[in-house]
């Protein structure tokens, strides 16, 4: 099995951006890797974003994705933008070694991301 590590807790900044590292221990020499961020709230699991990349190349999410990221070896630096207080929850990093065979899947324990909406600026007379 493939071990995936990620931080237990991350606090989003005042602009609603949270970053964390997802690191995996590859059992083989993968050339194609897929990274997915899943959000678990209660018993519901939803896909936040996903990207497939070739080892040594840049991580590319879809244009409309709220995620960006960079990869370095067996480490992926993930950034999620546009978060609001209601998005506070457990964000799980899933890593799949897609090619060459054999396929491997690894799932992290999740990063609890806390998002605090900024206080609106008081009106100034």
């Amino acid at each position: 099995a493939m071990h995936v590590a990620q931080p237990a807790v991350v606090l989003a900044n005042s602009r609603g951006t949270a970053s964390f590292v997802c690191e995996y221990a590859s059992p083989g020499k993968a050339t194609e890797v897929r990274v997915t961020v899943l959000r678990q709230a209660d018993s519901q699991v939803t896909e936040v974003c996903a990207a497939t990349y070739m080892m040594g190349n840049e991580l590319t999410f879809l244009d409309d994705s709220i995620c960006t990221g960079t990869s370095s070896g067996n480490q992926v630096n993930l950034t999620i933008q546009g978060l609001r207080a209601m998005d506070t929850g457990l964000y799980i990093c899933k890593v799949e070694l897609m090619y060459p065979p054999p396929y491997y899947m690894g799932i992290g324990n999740g990063t609890q991301i806390y998002v605090i909406d900024p206080e609106p600026c008081p009106d100034s007379d």
Epitope: A1, V45, E47, Y103, M105
Partner: antibody
Amino acid sequence: QVQLVESGGGVVQPGRSLRLSCVASGFTFSSHGMHWVRQAPGKGLEWVAVIWYDGRNKYYADSVKGRFTISRDNSKNTLFLQMNSLRAEDTAVYYCARGGHFGPFDYWGQGTLVTVSS
Amino acid sequence: EIVLTQSPGTLSLSPGERATLSCRASQSISSSFLAWYQQRPGQAPRLLIYGASSRATGIPDRFSGSGSGTDFTLTISRLEPEDFAVYYCQQYGTSPWTFGQGTKVEIK
């Protein structure tokens, strides 16, 4: 709700071909790996093949490698299994199954029976 | 290939009794990637347990899973009439995906 409906099964002679289809609904098809699993009469479950997300990556059981081809059409939410050079031992109920976000096969179709007999 | 061996092959019990099913792997697997399925006669398999111990949506709490490494267990605390079926374990952490040969739980 999630639904998977297989079709295309039937009786076919050894050496001939058959194409199975599985139409999916109720979820984002392209976000899931899709599998074919078969069950010979009175026997257990045997994984056959998987196709990932955009359809580029595929894996097969050794027993069908070189004879079966899995494919998908994400625009039509449909999974396919092209079965060539069929043998008597391929006789089984064929199920399509969705790979859940955490990996297990969380939804299954009702199955379609393929009988290879002369 | 990871081989899964289930025991016993058949379990003869009465409604209300406790059922304990075993699944042994030929090599150590992460508990994150062990599932149990139920298959009633003439029906498709249904996911019961994933990650060795997490119940799938809508599965009653009389079903529980445990284990790690190479030894895993499915427990049905009190058998209901609809629980008499065949149960399969499966590993899904690496290819090829493999199933155990099944345990049939039948009415005594």
